[in-house]
């Protein structure tokens, strides 16, 4: 029967009538002729995370798709031959009759493949997110443990102080906190976790043993130690923590005074005529996720913005920036700045006391969720996320959001690179007006407040637990200006990596070993990216992000500042201008010295490199008490470590709810760093059953100190 058609075979047959072999249905389409080139399809599985089932489904669809492509190619060939007047056999005719069906099936299969690939990507993303979340949770738990270790070491360290021992034995309100036996137990345990150097053991072996003891204590194991068990010891330590002894009044605390809290700041509506006032949010529990966060839009790719609306800056956002400016000091030595025309012209206020009062009023007024992030939280050496932010919302795995770090003023730049561990002293203090990255050439260089170092300090009454202010910036508006060219970009944020998109507020009243550094929260939500595109956006964000600062347009003298009052330990590092990628933009600024913080390898203290390089015996240099002028009582004295896992215990800083008095520094615009001065109340000696000369470096041996002028 004539089911044969013209054959392309090597046979000697010339073209003849079409073969009558009728092929049934669609099966005819599948074989004859050259296979159409199968279209390339993206790899169905992008990694081990893909589930086996999804792989199989995609494999089946892929195979089906190839077959259909092949079939369609054949049909196209048949059609072409028919058009040339060639005869097709029945099989081919049957196949051609199914052309539309094959085409439809092909489209359907492609759509199906797209859907399943999207689904597969979603699954992958979900798995990655879950893995990341689990990783973050592990890190958070790890960090909690680390925090607990630090608290424990702190307490054990303080127990070497006779006064502390006496206080704990006498107790508060006459109820003893620790008995003599319990103190002895802790002394014994102290020798295990902070042993004398045994030269017969390698250092890491010695600390390995110590770490096992610490671990078992954290676990509260029933194993025997020092004539008791780790569980009992843990209970003893927890009792010390819960006694709030280290929060008691003999320790100065950080935070604003009551009258400062009550004070209200004068309005600045006249400075930002177009901004609509937005009521400051009431103080909220620190565990809540902030409702308004400052979003630095330069941080996002320009292509993500479509809105052409004019950027609006709320009036109290500007106030907040002013406060931040007043908290940031910049040396006058910076290259002279040419004031650029801003909508807000900075004017140096005459009376330093008035300025300081205003700053304090502003700080007190703003009780919203201001996000403070200390430097140690910005140490991302292993590309890990800050565990303190896990509870807020896990980051989209594909968006590596860089976390900027606020720069420190340039000091001794010529020696900075060669001696990164040197701790320079700031000769003078100038303001660092923050350039807001808004469009329309608007730069929020607010009036600069130059609070003087007045010798009198306000008595500190019940300090507020958190100093928080909401920094609000509409996230749906377009940013016209990106960062500056390298030449004109003075001070930059050094960006960390892989920060989650959301973050809760972090208490400014932090542990002293995590010095505060106000940083705008770069974890605020950014305009969402289409889900299917997220995989392509791994590299969309720049590896380092630059936040510009304009130098102070007006030179404001500060003769009152005494050299000894400027012992700010900042360990700054002058990065070269090419250290960070620049985003081109039209925002012109006067050239300044480029200062940036590199990530330091000291994440758990203050990540400043402050206490490095000194002799171990020099620890006392960091323990002293400041004079009455600034009310700073150094060392660990000013915080209460809460050993128990409070609801906020995921946040390293929020453990220490009793604020510590950095007020002289905060109001005067210094970056407070962990300092211990010269006067520890007494070295740990005989009471610890140590024997031999007292060890001057009772605390954490791994902390190197550095002498500060």
């Amino acid at each position: 029967m004539p089911s044969a058609t013209s054959h392309s075979g090597s046979g000697s047959k010339s073209s003849g009538p079409p073969p009558p072999s009728g092929s049934s249905g669609s099966e005819a389409a599948a074989g004859a002729g050259a296979a159409a080139p199968a279209s390339q399809h993206p790899a169905t599985g992008t990694g081990a995370v893909q589930t086996e089932a999804m792989k199989q489904i995609l494999g089946v669809i892929d195979k089906k798709l190839r077959n259909l492509e092949k079939k369609k190619g054949k049909l196209d060939d048949y059609q072409e031959r028919m058009n040339k007047g060639e005869r097709l056999n029945q099989d081919q005719l049957d196949a051609v009759s199914k052309y539309q069906e094959v085409t439809n099936n092909l489209e359907f299969a492609k759509e199906l493949q797209r859907s399943f690939m999207a689904l597969s990507q979603d699954i992958q993303k979900t798995i990655k997110k879950t893995a990341r979340r689990e990783q973050l949770m592990r890190e958070e738990a790890e960090q909690k443990r680390l925090k607990t270790v630090l608290e424990l070491q702190y307490v054990l360290d303080k127990l070497g102080d006779d006064e502390v021992r006496t206080d704990l034995k006498q107790g508060l309100n006459g109820v003893p906190i620790l008995s003599e036996e319990e103190l002895s137990l802790l002394d014994e345990f102290y020798k295990l976790v902070d042993p004398e150097r045994d030269m017969s053991l390698r250092l890491n072996e010695q600390y390995e043993h110590a770490s096992i003891h610490l671990w078992d204590l954290l676990e509260g194991k029933e194993k025997p130690v020092c004539g008791t068990t780790y569980k009992v010891l843990k209970e003893i330590v927890e009792r010390v923590f819960q006694s709030n002894y280290f929060d008691s009044t003999h320790n100065h605390q950080n935070g604003l005074c009551e009258e400062e809290e009550a004070a209200s700041a004068p309005a600045v509506e006249d400075q930002v005529p177009e901004a609509e006032p937005e009521p400051a949010e009431e103080y909220t529990e620190q565990s809540e996720v902030e409702s308004t966060e400052y979003v630095n839009r330069q941080f996002m790719a320009e292509t993500q913005f479509t809105s052409g609306e004019k950027e609006q800056v709320d009036e109290w956002t500007v106030e907040t920036v002013e406060v931040v400016n007043s908290l940031q000091q910049q040396p006058q030595a910076a290259s002279p700045s040419v004031p650029e025309p801003h909508s807000l012209t900075p004017v140096a206020q005459a009376d330093p006391l008035v300025r300081r009062q205003r700053v304090q009023d502003l700080m007190a007024q703003m009780q919203g969720p201001y996000n403070f992030i200390q430097d140690s939280m910005l140490d991302f050496e292993n590309q890990t996320l800050d565990p303190a932010i896990v509870s807020a919302q896990p980051m989209n795995p594909t968006q590596n959001m860089d976390m900027p770090q606020l720069v420190c003023p340039p000091v001794h730049s010529e020696s900075r690179l060669a001696q990164p561990n040197q701790v320079p002293v700031q000769p003078e203090a100038t303001q660092v007006p923050l350039v807001s990255s808004t469009s329309e050439g608007y730069t929020a260089s607010q009036p600069l407040y130059q609070p003087s170092h007045a010798t009198e300090q306000r008595p500190q009454k019940e300090p507020i637990d958190q100093i928080q202010a909401t920094i609000s910036l509409n996230t749906d508006q377009t940013t016209a200006s990106s960062s500056l060219p390298a030449a004109s970009q003075p001070q930059v944020f050094q960006a960390g990596t892989s920060k989650p998109l959301h973050s809760s507020g972090i208490n400014v009243n932090a542990a002293p070993f995590q010095s505060m550094q106000t940083v705008f929260n770069m974890n605020a939500p950014v305009p969402p990216v289409n889900e299917p595109e997220t995989l392509k956006q791994q590299n969309q964000y720049q590896a380092s992000y630059n936040q510009s600062f304009s130098s102070q347009p007006h030179q404001v003298e500060q003769t009152e500042l005494q050299q000894e009052q400027l012992q700010t330990v900042v360990g700054t590092y002058h990065g070269s201008p090419d250290q960070s990628h620049q985003v081109t933009g039209n925002h012109q600024q006067p050239p300044q010295q480029n200062t940036g913080f590199p990530r330091s390898n000291q994440p758990y203290y203050n990540s400043r490199g402050v206490s490095r390089g000194g002799s171990r015996g020099a620890r006392g240099l960091m323990n002293g008490y400041r004079g009455p002028a600034n009310g700073f009582r150094g060392g660990y004295d000013g915080y209460r470590p809460s050993f128990s896992n409070t609801p906020n215990s995921g946040y390293t800083q929020s453990q220490f709810s009793a604020p510590r008095d950095y007020s002289g520094y905060q109001r005067d615009g210094y970056q407070q760093n962990f300092k211990r001065g010269s006067g520890q109340s007494g070295p740990r000696g005989a009471p610890r059953g140590r024997g031999g000369p007292p060890r001057p470096n009772r605390g954490m041996p791994q902390m190197n100190t550095q002498q500060v002028n």
Epitope: A4, G11, P17, P20, G22, S23, S24, N89, Q90
Partner: antibody, heavy 114, light 112 residues
Framework: QVQLVESGGGLVKPGGSLRLSCAAS?????????MSWVRQAPGKGLEWIAY????????AYANWAKGRFTISRDNAKNSLYLQMNSLRAEDTAVYFC??????WGQGTLVTVSS | DIQMTQSPSSLSAAVGDRVTIKCQAS??????LAWYQQKPGKPPKRLIY???NLDSGVPSRFSGSGSGTDFTFTISSLQPEDIATYYC??????????????FGGGTKVEIK
Amino acid sequence: QVQLVESGGGLVKPGGSLRLSCAASGFSFSGSYYMSWVRQAPGKGLEWIAYIYIGDGVTAYANWAKGRFTISRDNAKNSLYLQMNSLRAEDTAVYFCARGNRLWGQGTLVTVSS
Amino acid sequence: DIQMTQSPSSLSAAVGDRVTIKCQASQSISSYLAWYQQKPGKPPKRLIYDASNLDSGVPSRFSGSGSGTDFTFTISSLQPEDIATYYCQCTAVSSATIYGNAFGGGTKVEIK
């Protein structure tokens, strides 16, 4: 239901003629089909006779069938025909009509005998 | 006309055996070849078209291969229901020289 039903078979004397019909149902003769006739002598194999292309009426025959057998179709009646002349004893067989090479009728028996 | 030569004319195999039937065309017919199964008293049923394409509903133990002049039909594992006679057929057509849709002589498959 798509089917083919052959008819017109029977006993015929050698030298005689016979016209076989194949009625198609369930599909139209206006389509792109080759309609064929195939026969099978008792206990023997299949033997292709001829085909016609419904679309344009082009026909093809086996060499041995040329001149004696004629294939035709009536699209209006949805029917296929085989006109057999000068029948011989060796033409005794079951005659099948087929659409292409997939759909077959049950066949009709033609016996050529004196 | 084109001649189709099929071999063997009959074969006997055990259930589960692999059965192979050959078909040779007197001239090249590309891949225009079909294979049929016919059981006594029934019309033929096409199993393979275009030399190697399996018809829908046909068990996958049946397969075909070849092109040009030499073709092979295989039953990978003979089953009792496979007892039948198998035919090859040229399905080529051309406008000038008529190949004809000649059948092979058939191969009768039996179970041992």
